[in-house]
Amino acid sequence: DAEFRHDSGYEVHHQKLVFFAEDVGSNKGAIIGLMVGGVVIA
């Protein structure tokens, strides 16, 4: 079986919880901005 990891911890999405622990960053939403030379520019 492929390694299984649940979705990352509690955030509210229209009263829907992200219920399962998983890697940090999953289901966190996109970063707004552009990465240039290691600096995020809005």
Epitope: F4, R5, H6, D7, Y10, H13, K16, F19, A21, N27
Partner: antibody, heavy 112, light 112 residues
Amino acid sequence: EVQLVESGGGLVQPGGSLRLSCAASGFTFSSYGMSWVRQAPGKGLELVASINSNGGSTYYPDSVKGRFTISRDNAKNTLYLQMNSLRAEDTAVYYCASGDYWGQGTLVTVSS
Amino acid sequence: DIVMTQSPLSLPVTPGEPASISCRSSQSLVYSNGDTYLHWYLQKPGQSPKLLIYKVSNRFSGVPDRFSGSGSGTDFTLKISRVEAEDVGVYYCSQSTHVPWTFGGGTKVEIK
């Protein structure tokens, strides 16, 4: 409103197959891991399959491994459970669950 | 797999009186992000499980404040400050820190 609606249960003979479906609505289905949990008559809750948000990773306990297959169609907001080589001990109510929300369940009866 | 052990198995209660259910896990439920994914469900007769408490002590949407959760590491407690007739059913603890998602065996709460 979050809703999970199962279908596809019924009476099947030992060795037979069934495919359960779970129609999800009210949330961004493609962003969440999903599971199937079963409950035999008068018994507790048993996880039978889990799948991550993009369908790339799955988990099965030994009791169903090699017989059951979980899958999802994120375009249709639907979760599936293909059950093959069914046994009498697979008789149970099968719930589609996201952890915080559960469907109403669908009864699978395996009997000759 | 993480084993979840609940006690008592059965709990006769008097309306208006407090009640308490214990849950112990075979390993720590603290995840690497510091959160503890220990939850409590109530399954009323003929219904699917409903989430009461998530992450040890957080009441889910619509859950009355007479329900509270506490604990840490491997030992957890669900308390009902004043039991009402509608609280009867089977209570399950559950963990989703570790794969697979696992459940306690249940505690049946009934009115004396």
